[in-house]
């Protein structure tokens, strides 16, 4: 049978040939009658055999990391017979390891993100090096990790390559660190090979900074003419944190006057001071408010960094604006009796300059020929007024500052012209009446009514009478209906168209004013030739035809 030990050949041997071992048959008695042969991958090129002795030699340098074992076949032949002495057999040559490979970090580059202010012991990242040497062969591939750069903030676990925080870090002081890790094989013993890697460790932000005002005192100004909602200025705080952790909200901490408000511009992170209530320079021209600023988002565990909000004081100076005159009332209503003489007193309007300088005021009336106003605001008439022409006057009174004629205010003034009884009642229309020749006594000829242009406080009441002459010699009589109407009746039987074709009756109408006024109104009565029915229709028709130029037969 075959006789051999396990074959090993060290890698990286520089000699021309290196004795690996000997193959032999136990039938070989050393008389050189056997011939040994080597077959298989590497036979003749990497390994050769002494055909006589069976000694195997490596004739080239081997690299275990390239090939760690060779499987060869051996034959032994009896030279005399040419026959195989032993059956062909497979054997293995193992390449033994030497420490010829340094550790390598294959997952480079390394980058890790860890929250700032993380406590000691927080895991950052694990780095792993690979060593191509044989892990089963001594310590050639047993690695030890150490920190070349990164103290005192980081540490590395020697056997695992786990990087941990060893000291709290503040992103606001330094936001990234380069850590250099070394991996050594041979567990760091002499002759060990090493490799290094760099790890970029970035600190993510936590909200460990509160916003702080850039200024402890601000000065703003606002015009007294500014409407509510006006932005009067901005205030600014800074926060060393970034992103969401730097978002802030401004608010009023102190404003006794409740005149101002602060809104936050979330794009610029500024506080905008706005006017909540209109200001009046003459009432208050200096304000002081205190504003505070806080982060929008604060985690409970970070509250210790946000105990007292930063505050600032804002002085606000109100700027005076020359304001137009201010009337005592928004409008005035005055009364004056009609027919009062020119220059009569109507009323007084009053405006003042609301500013501190108290400019004198000049008054004027826009487009009026009926009224006048003096520098004291006294309104008088320039003509006598007639209520029956105009009962109300709508005036526009303008007040102008003497020191600044551009400062003008106008208000409406309503003047009511009060009635006096200066008009007597009169017929409400023109009456044309007709009576038949054959009319009997007591026949109703006409119903009349009256109007009075005067205004009556109570209801108008009119009194109807015939004139004295007509009462004494009248063919007609009048009855007052007591309802502002009266009826005219015949006072005799029969009329003669030929003798008296027309009657003119004077009717007196009196009103109930104080003093009472009376007018004389003439009623025209035509005598008609009527048919038997006593209708005046034909008479009226005849009248119409005559008035149009036709003659009736």
């Amino acid at each position: 049978g075959w006789v051999w030990n396990q074959f090993f050949v060290p890698e990286e041997m520089n000699t021309t040939s290196h004795h690996v071992g000997r193959l032999r048959s136990d039938l070989d008695n050393g008389n050189n009658s056997f011939q040994y042969k080597l077959l298989g991958a590497g036979a003749g090129s990497t390994f050769i055999i002494d055909e006589r002795t069976g000694d195997i030699y490596a004739i080239e340098k081997l690299d275990r990391e390239e090939r760690s074992l060779y499987i060869l076949r051996a034959q032994v032949i009896d030279i005399t017979t040419g026959r195989a002495v032993e059956p062909e057999s497979e054997f293995v040559i193992k390449v033994s390891d030497i420490n010829d490979n340094e550790p390598k970090f294959l997952d480079e580059p390394y980058e890790a993100i860890v929250p700032e202010m993380s406590p000691e012991g927080t895991l950052v990242i694990q780095v792993t090096a690979s060593d191509a040497d044989d892990p089963s062969s001594g310590n050639n591939a047993r690695l030890l990790y150490s920190l070349l750069q990164g103290q005192p903030y980081f540490s590395v676990e020697p056997t695992t390559g786990v990087i941990r925080i060893s000291s709290k870090m503040d992103r606001e002081l330094q936001d990234e660190y380069w850590v250099i890790i070394q991996a050594k094989d041979m567990i760091g013993q002499p002759g060990a090979l090493s490799g290094t890697t760099s790890v970029l460790i970035k600190l993510s932000d936590v909200n460990d900074n509160k916003p702080i005002f850039k200024e402890s005192l601000y000065r703003l100004t606002v015009s007294e003419s500014a409407p509510t909602g006006t932005s009067i200025g901005t205030i600014m705080a800074y926060d060393n944190d970034i992103g969401e952790n730097a978002e802030m909200d401004y608010s009023i901490e102190e404003d006794d006057s409740q005149t101002f408000d602060i809104i936050t511009n979330h794009e610029t992170q500024e506080g905008i001071v706005i006017l909540k209530k209109k200001v009046n320079f003459e009432h208050q021209n200096h304000y002081g408010i205190r504003a505070k600023v806080k982060n929008h988002h604060v985690d409970k565990q970070l509250m210790k960094y946000h105990t007292e909000a930063s505050t600032t004081f804002i002085k606000i100076q109100v700027e005076d604006v020359d304001e137009p005159p201010l009337f005592l009332l928004p409008y005035y209503i005055f009364e004056i009796f009609e027919e009062t003489p020119q220059g009569s007193f109507v009323g007084v309007v009053s405006a003042t300059d609301p500013d501190n300088r108290k400019s004198p005021i000049r008054y004027s009336i826009t487009r009026s020929k009926v009224f006048n106003i003096d520098d004291n605001g006294t309104i008088t008439t320039t003509n006598s007024l007639d209520r029956e022409i105009s009962a109300w006057y709508n005036l526009s009174i303008t007040a102008t500052e003497k020191y600044n004629i551009e400062q003008i205010s106008s208000i409406p003034v309503y003047v009511q012209v009060l009635n006096i009884n200066d008009h007597a009642p009169e017929f409400s229309q023109y009456y044309e009446s007709y009576v038949c020749e054959n009319a009997g006594s007591g026949q109703v000829i006409q119903t009349i009514s009256a109007v009075d242009r005067d205004e009556s406080i109570e209801e108008h009441h009119f009194y109807f009478n015939l004139s004295v002459e007509d009462t004494n010699s009248s063919s007609f009589t009048i009855i007052d209906n007591q309802d502002n109407t009266a009826v005219i009746l015949t006072n005799r039987t029969g009329f003669n168209l030929q003798e008296e074709p027309i009657f003119y009756i004077s009717i007196l109408i009196a009103d109930n004013g104080i003093p009472s006024l009376t007018s004389t109104n003439t009623l025209t009565i035509h005598v008609c030739d009527c048919d038997d029915s006593g209708s005046t229709q034909t008479c009226q028709y005849q009248e119409l035809m005559l008035s149009m130029g036709f003659k009736t037969e």
Epitope: E215, S216, L217, Y218, R219, T221, E254, D256, S257, E282, H283, Q284, N285, H286, Y287, G288, R290, F313, K315
Partner: antibody
């Protein structure tokens, strides 16, 4: 600590212009938010505010003195000045310069005052 | 303008006693706009209280201020010998006006 010091003639003739200067030390006159005032005190009487100025040159005066008062500022010299024209004996007083406070318009820092007498 | 009236004109008290000085405004002012000053002869006024109850830097806690609207008070809880002098109130809301002063003298 801010300190203020008034300087100027102690005697002014009637109808002339009274001129005083206040020099600020221990702080900048250009400090944001602070107003620099002149206040006077007639002999044995109360205090009367004359006017103030901001470092930008914006001034505001007591309405009763407005027509005669001018306050100006020189930031390069850290000084501000008062001019009161057409003086009469009624303007005889101790004149103080002052700075307002960090939390309001009260007067936190005062100069020691200078007596100005108006007399011919 | 806002007129400030101080009463009494003179307050005669003994050291160790409590002093109550009054300042009345002619119209309402916000409490944040009133200050008190102390003035010793030949010296400039010194800020005591502002707004109306905050003590200025270095002012002893025996001085306190209170009030709102039109009525304000300066209280000196226990008079020390150096407290016998003149006190002024000042409003700084509508322009700046001072009260006529109250003199605290030794009884």
């Amino acid at each position: 600590q801010v300190q203020l010091q008034e300087s100027g003639p102690g005697l002014v003739k009637p109808s002339q212009t009274l001129s005083l200067t206040c020099t600020v030390s221990g702080g900048s006159i250009s400090s944001s938010g602070y107003y620099w005032s002149w206040i006077r005190q007639h002999p044995g009487k109360g205090l009367e505010w004359i006017g103030y100025i901001y470092y930008t040159g914006s001034a505001y005066y007591n309405p009763s003195l407005k027509s005669r008062v001018t306050i100006s500022v020189d930031t390069s010299k850290n000084q501000f000045s008062l001019k009161l024209s057409s003086v009469t004996a009624a303007d005889t007083a101790v004149y103080y310069c002052a700075r307002d406070g960090s939390s309001g318009w009260y007067f936190q820092y005062w100069g020691q005052g200078t007596l100005v007498t108006v007399s011919s | 303008e806002i007129v400030l009236t101080q009463s009494p004109g003179t307050l005669s008290l003994s050291p160790g006693e409590r002093a109550t000085l009054s300042c009345r405004a002619s119209r309402n002012i916000s409490s944040s706009y009133l200050a008190w000053y102390q003035q010793k002869p030949g010296q400039a006024p010194r800020l005591l209280i502002y707004g109306p109850s905050s003590r200025a830097t270095g002012i002893p806690d025996r001085f306190s201020g209170s009030g709102s609207g039109t009525d304000f008070t300066l209280t000196i809880s226990r008079l020390e010998p150096e407290d016998f002098t003149v006190y002024y109130c000042q409003q700084y809301g509508s322009s700046f006006t001072f009260g006529p002063g109250t003199k605290v003298d030794i009884k």
